[in-house]
């Protein structure tokens, strides 16, 4: 069970530095091609990793201007890296029910990263929430 | 166990750069985030930025932007942040800090005096 | 950038003593609050993640509350060793701020 829940750990403190990135990449909204994305909000209990797909799958890009335009696309790369795979994750992508990313709002960058920090910080909460007391290493 | 090891104190001319070394020991390196935070004699705690050990990508506080650099040598388990044009005002002692949910482990500090 | 307003900045109490520290966001902060000890030459140390998780190794006299924007760090019994400088600092938003200090002194 702990090296499971150390694994859960690992793969949470990942999610918590995707919320830096994604606040990196706010101070650069400008900087973003003004493009609407598909961008999940209130998303429902056990789609959250299928939501948090439809976020990497994005097509968020940088305009191209200024001298911003390496910091953007490093962190956007880093938004799409593949997370390591969990139990939770597995057992999500069996459902079916969730709604396709298409079906999602879709939303102007700025909108975009604020919907993609909430959900990141909801995993992160539930992840936290339904876990015993100690620490990341305990 | 986790630990940080820092470099010693330095002192350094109005002008001049310094670069504190922080060595990390007892988990993954580039599992974890580091944060570096200083502190001015008897002032409150002030971030300075993050880099993640794997691949180098930084974020740096609006406050220090321009004149400091996060780099690692991940064949030492070894972060280091530089900071240029130093002023009196950076007299401080700097902290590294790995991050997981909150900055759960630091190194002693290093105290960098800034003085002609 | 999000102001964290600690209070009190200093206090006096005795061994056994139930002590309070609060710190104040100025905005929601979704519990990524964090509290740290700081004593003189030595290293700081996380007490408390996420508005209320015990740090591994941290005793059970400490604990922390709130939501919001108010969270609140009690130390139950006061022991000799807890007479230092208390930090809280928020991971909601970059960049990470902390709050002033609080330091609880010898009455």
């Known amino acids: 069970h702990k090296s499971s829940s150390q694994g859960q750990d690992r793969h949470m403190i990942r999610m918590r530095q995707l919320i830096d990135i994604v606040d990196q990449l706010k101070n650069y909204v400008n900087d973003l091609v003004p493009e609407f994305l598909p961008a999940p909000e209130d998303v429902e209990t056990n789609c959250e990793w299928s939501a948090f797909s439809c976020f990497q799958k994005a097509q968020l890009k940088s305009a191209n201007t200024g001298n911003n335009e390496r910091i953007i696309n490093v962190s956007i790369k880093k938004l799409k890296r593949k997370p390591p795979s969990t139990n939770a994750g597995r057992r999500q992508k069996h459902r079916l029910t969730c709604p396709s990313c298409d079906s999602y709002e879709k939303k102007p960058p700025k909108e975009f990263l604020e919907r993609f920090k909430s959900l990141l910080q909801k995993m992160i909460h539930q992840h936290l929430s339904s876990r015993t007391h100690g620490s990341e290493d305990s | 166990q986790v630990q940080l090891v820092q470099s010693g104190a330095e002192v350094k001319k109005p002008g001049a750069s310094v670069k504190v070394s922080c060595k990390a020991s007892g988990y993954t390196f580039t599992d974890y985030w580091m944060h570096w935070v200083r502190q001015a004699p008897g002032q409150g705690l002030e971030w300075m930025g993050t880099?993640?050990?794997?691949?180098?990508?930084?974020i740096y506080s609006q406050n220090f932007k321009g004149r400091v650099t996060m780099t690692r040598d991940t064949s030492t388990s070894t972060v280091y942040m530089e900071l240029s044009s130093l002023r009196s005002e950076d007299t401080a002692v700097y902290y590294c800090?790995?991050?997981?949910?909150?900055?759960?482990?630091w190194g002693q500090g290093t105290l960098v005096t800034v003085s002609s | 950038d999000i102001q964290l307003t600690q209070s009190p900045s200093s206090l006096s109490a005795s061994v056994g003593d139930r002590v309070t520290i609060t710190c104040r966001a100025s905005q929601d902060i979704s519990n990524f609050l964090n509290w740290y000890q700081q004593k003189p030459g030595k290293a700081v140390k996380l007490l408390i993640y996420y508005t209320s998780r015990l740090h591994s190794g941290v005793p059970s006299r400490f604990s922390g509350s709130g939501s919001g924007t108010d969270y609140t760090l009690t130390i139950s019994s006061l022991q000799p060793e807890d007479f230092a400088t208390y930090f809280c600092?928020?991971?909601?938003?970059?960049?990470?701020?902390f709050g002033g200090g609080t330091k609880v002194e010898i009455k």
């Open positions: 800090a790995r991050y997981g949910f909150a900055m759960d482990y």
């Open positions: 600092q928020q991971g909601h938003t970059l960049p990470r701020t």
């Open positions: 880099i993640d050990p794997s691949d180098q990508y930084t």
